[in-house]
């Protein structure tokens, strides 16, 4: 059976019917259906005016405008809001009421596309394998990225979140039109990886999607990840404005100027340095979602009531942090280079700025505990990877799972850890599943492009597609049309159960309490450490002060602090402007090397970015108490400039007041309502509070945005605020 021309709200569309084998099964493929009008720079997306006749939807459209991997030119187009649909068909009747899976790609909110990289004439995000093996409809789409998708002044002049609103437009289009393609508009599952996983999470939390989403899967990224929310967008907006010659003194004039600036110039005004970094890479990614008071009405930690009826899977790869650790500390992938205590201490101190010397020392001690027993370079390098994996992915994901579970009504929660090792031949043997390694298996690459894959890779892929599509059908990854290798139990606050996905799966694959000691450390011990003031000294490495980090700014100064000079051993200043900064790491669809044997550039789509607001405390141990998140606006300062502004400033040491209080048993005390700048962080309601979803506040055309404090502009963000 085949669909032929399908009538949508925009008009008729015609795709291609691709026959599969001799049994008469086929898949209808539609590429390049517009779901919104061509975009206007830094404006919300608008409905597409439609067309007459029948639109031939046979080719992918261009990605949204973005910088190339070398960051010296652009590709893509402003007219980019298109989606793609794969509909599996049997022999006789056309499909009806199929579950729908909508993919949101990653790429640091900076790059990517709905089709992904092309290898062997097969695109990374080609939905055919998922659709046909799982009997679901797959939808992928483009959304705006980088400055065009996320630049914000932090107020109504440029509220930001344009890329998130593009995503919402696509989801709403699917809801309204997918029945005509044979889909069930009441059974939509979002899934995505990295920035896409975080986007999935944010979409479930936004009041704009009320009633649109039934289920969601976040792979290696959640709304609480420390790189997802930009707390000082004005800082970044001004950097771009300066670069393109717009006035920065008045936000309204700056906004008007930015809107009429050549979009290519806006895109190229922002560069991410990747070598000689003074600070961890995630400090440098600035154009990400913001709390705009409307689409994202409050800190994500306070929005989990909005996802109370949405079934949720979230998980990470066991070495998600590897690609970032190897950028922050290149010795990790080099057999002839050593990671020293000083190196690691410096890295730790840069991630723990707000907790000062105690934060750095305590964290360093916790992570290096195994070094006395096993001082091998392999162990030390693994520790660095584990540290970044924990901070950037694992801990925020665990907290998101706990939050979802605590707020869920009928919704189910599932957790996983993907551990099938990377296929990258250039990596050391000890490397596990790196960031984005999971994507190729979810999209069935071992079947679509068998060259370079082994039977065990097909086993992993088959299992993931089965779990993912069963979940989309029923809300339970074990139940559906596809057999699964072992039973995946739901995550609860009591068991903290998770499924480990590997090539050999059985009853022992269901595990409990992943990295509990480290989770406890971040959410209890670290959290309880006092936040240091701007006047206090920044951490000094244990081996003297030869590697002392520059002193953070302490006032309203717009100028960045000068890094140490001479032979202090300070790291080099990151490249600025057009100095030939090295390329951004491969991002899943760039087509750039390094290419794994499968060619699908399973390389990471998402460098983490920015400062997400303190995640909550997940349950620890058998108390069964729901996680207690901090909620106050800690006013995370901005991320450093990466253009021609000179060296980036050092992160501040924070002035957010006392840390949030972790759960201390079954107190039964009522939740405290946030009261602004209180010295103690308020505790929002958790669990089955029955709290209504947080609504948008104000008109979406000019969303209210929490004001940002210009006085903090020269500061860097506190990356971890658990």
């Amino acid at each position: 059976a085949k669909l032929g021309a399908v009538y949508t709200e925009g008009g008729f569309v015609e795709g291609v019917n691709k026959k599969l084998g001799l049994l008469g099964d086929s898949v209808d493929i539609f590429k390049g259906i517009p779901f919104a009008a061509p975009t206007k720079a830094l404006e919300n997306p608008q409905p597409h005016p439609g067309w007459q006749g029948t639109l031939k939807a046979k080719n992918f459209k261009k990605r949204c405008l973005q910088a190339t991997i070398t960051q010296d030119s652009t590709y893509g187009d402003e007219d980019c809001l298109y989606l793609n649909i794969w509909v599996p068909q049997g022999r006789k009747q056309v499909s009806r009421d199929l579950p729908v899976m909508i993919w949101i790609y990653g790429g640091a909110f900076l790059m990517g596309s709905g089709h992904g990289a092309n290898f062997l004439n097969n695109y990374l995000y080609d939905g055919e394998e998922i659709a046909t093996r799982g009997n679901v409809i797959v939808v992928t789409f483009n959304y705006r990225v980088g400055p065009l998708g996320f630049l914000s002044t932090g107020d109504a002049n440029l509220p930001g979140n344009y890329g998130l609103r593009d995503q919402h437009m696509a989801i709403a289009w699917v809801k309204r039109n997918i029945a005509a393609f044979g889909g069930d508009p009441n059974n939509i599952t979002l899934f995505g990886e990295s920035a896409g996983g975080a986007s999935v999470s944010l979409q479930t939390l936004s009041p704009y999607n009320k009633g649109l989403i039934r289920r969601a899967i976040s792979q290696s990224g959640v709304a609480l990840s420390p790189w997802v929310i930009q707390k000082n967008p004005l800082f970044w907006a001004k950097k771009v404005a300066e670069k393109v010659g717009c006035p920065v003194g008045d936000a309204a004039r700056m906004a008007q100027c930015l809107k009429v600036t050549d979009p290519r110039a806006l895109t190229l005004a922002y560069k991410v340095p990747l070598a000689g970094l003074e600070y961890p890479m995630l400090h440098y990614v600035g154009f990400v979602p913001v709390i705009d008071g409307d689409f994202i009405p409050a800190d994500p930690i306070n929005l989990y009531a909005n996802a109370a009826d949405i079934d949720y899977i979230a998980g990470t790869n066991n070495m998600d942090g590897h690609i970032f650790a190897s950028i922050d500390m290149p010795a990790i992938n080099k057999g002839n280079k050593k990671v020293t205590e000083e190196d690691f201490y410096k890295l730790v101190s840069e991630f723990t700025i707000t907790k000062g010397l105690r934060g750095a020392k305590t964290t360093f001690d916790v992570y290096t505990e195994s070094w006395a027993q096993d001082p091998s370079q392999e162990n030390k390098k693994k520790t660095v990877v584990d540290f970044e994996t924990d901070v950037l992915f694992l801990v925020p994901t665990e907290i998101a799972l706990a939050q979802h579970r605590a707020n869920a009504k009928s919704a189910k929660t599932y957790a996983y850890l993907f551990s099938h090792p990377s296929r990258m031949p250039v990596y050391p043997k000890w490397v596990g599943a790196d960031h984005a390694d999971d994507i190729q298996y979810v999209f069935g690459k071992p079947f679509a492009t068998p060259t370079g894959y082994r039977p065990q890779d097909r086993t992993v892929s088959k299992a993931m597609i089965a779990y993912w599509t069963n979940f989309a059908k029923t809300g339970d990854p074990n139940m559906g049309d596809s057999a699964v290798p072992t039973h995946w139990e739901p995550y609860t606050t009591e068991n903290s159960g998770y499924l480990e996905i590997t090539k050999k799966m059985g009853s022992s694959s269901m595990k409990r309490s992943l990295r509990t000691n480290f989770l406890r450390y971040w959410t209890l011990t670290y959290l309880a450490l006092p936040t240091v003031t701007d006047q206090e000294a920044t951490p000094v490495p244990p081996t003297g002060d030869s590697e002392a980090t520059p002193v953070p700014p302490t006032g309203d100064s717009e100028t960045a602090p000068v890094p140490p000079t001479g032979d202090s051993g300070a790291p080099p200043v990151p490249p600025t402007g057009d100095s030939g900064a090295p390329p951004v790491p491969p991002t899943g669809d760039s087509g750039a090397p390094p290419v794994p044997p499968t060619g699908d550039s399973g390389a990471p789509p998402v460098p983490p970015t920015g400062d997400s607001g303190a995640p909550p405390v997940p349950p620890t141990g058998d108390s069964g108490a729901p996680p207690v998140p901090p909620t106050g606006d800690s006013g995370a300062p901005p991320v450093p400039p990466t253009g021609d502004a000179g060296p980036p400033p050092v992160p501040p040491t924070g002035d957010s007041g006392a840390p949030p209080v972790p759960p201390t048993g079954d107190s039964g005390a009522p939740p405290v309502t946030p009261t602004g700048d209180s010295e103690t962080a308020p505790v929002p309601p958790t669990g089955d509070s029955g709290a209504p979803p947080v609504p948008p506040t104000g008109d979406s055309e000019a969303a209210p945005v929490p004001p940002t404090d210009d006085s903090k502009e020269a500061q860097m963000p506190a990356v971890i605020r658990f």
Partner: antibody, heavy 119, light 105 residues
Framework: QVQLVQSGAEVKKPGASVKVSCKAS????????MHWVRQAPGQGLEWMGV????????SYNQKFQGRVTMTRDTSTSTVYMELSSLRSEDTAVYYC????????????WGQGTLVTVSS | DIQMTQSPSSLSASVGDRVTITCRAS?????LNWYQQKPGKAPKLLIY???SLASGVPSRFSGSGSGTDFTLTISSLQPEDFATYYC????????FGQGTKLEIK
């Protein structure tokens, strides 16, 4: 100017079929979708389906699926709507309506054809 | 299918009055149109895309709204405006509101 002229009133017995025509003029026939909308006596408007006169592609309201067929004759710039297995509740005025532009609303309407189903 | 609910279903007003008719969609929509129908006549397009005036329609008619809530406003009723008004959403399965009959008081 755009004109849509429909065929005359019909009286049919239950179980029979009716075929209503709509002749278009004043524009390029194949360039705009044509919709059919019906209105039962004293009731509201109900969308039945749409045809693209260019390639003959159709889409029908699920309610009428299997009973309605829309066709076109490009040589006479005419579209047809045939409804089978008529029942008394199909008694209504049937309108053809052309898109205004793009996926815009129904900007031009025929005068309507009354179909009465009675035994 | 998306349900469209108009309110009120009927109203009485006088020449010169300002009148507002509302239309609510059961879920968010992109395209909303308004039609006027007089007895024995075909409907006539008034407003498309929520707020755009169709050609030849007097400026006393205006439309607004987005998402799920929309309004049609007639700023100063004229004798020829007494008719039935329908809202219409344009998705892959278009639907109409049940109509609002505007009568002379």
């Amino acid at each position: 100017q755009v004109q849509l002229v429909q065929s005359g009133a019909e009286v049919k017995k239950p179980g029979a079929s009716v075929k209503v025509s709509c002749k278009a003029s004043g524009y390029t026939f194949t360039s705009y979708n044509m919709h059919w909308v019906r209105q039962a006596p004293g009731q509201g408007l109900e969308w039945m389906g749409v045809i693209n006169p260019g390639d003959g592609a159709t889409s029908y309201n699920q309610k009428f699926q299997g009973r309605v067929t829309m066709t076109r004759d490009t040589s006479t710039s005419t579209v047809y709507m045939e409804l089978s297995s008529l029942r008394s509740e199909d008694t209504a005025v049937y309108y053809c309506a052309r898109d205004y532009y793009g996926s815009s609303p129904l900007g031009y309407w025929g005068q309507g054809t009354l179909v009465t189903v009675s035994s | 299918d998306i349900q469209m609910t108009q309110s009120p279903s009927s109203l009485s007003a006088s020449v010169g009055d300002r009148v507002t008719i509302t239309c609510r969609a059961s879920s968010s929509i992109s395209y909303l149109n308004w039609y006027q129908q007089k007895p024995g006549k075909a409907p006539k397009l008034l407003i498309y895309a929520a707020s755009s005036l169709a050609s030849g329609v007097p400026s006393r008619f205006s439309g607004s709204g987005s998402g799920t809530d929309f309004t049609l406003t007639i700023s100063s009723l004229q004798p020829e405006d007494f008719a039935t008004y329908y809202c219409h959403q344009r998705s892959s399965s278009p639907t109409f509101g049940q109509g609002t009959k505007l009568e002379i008081k």
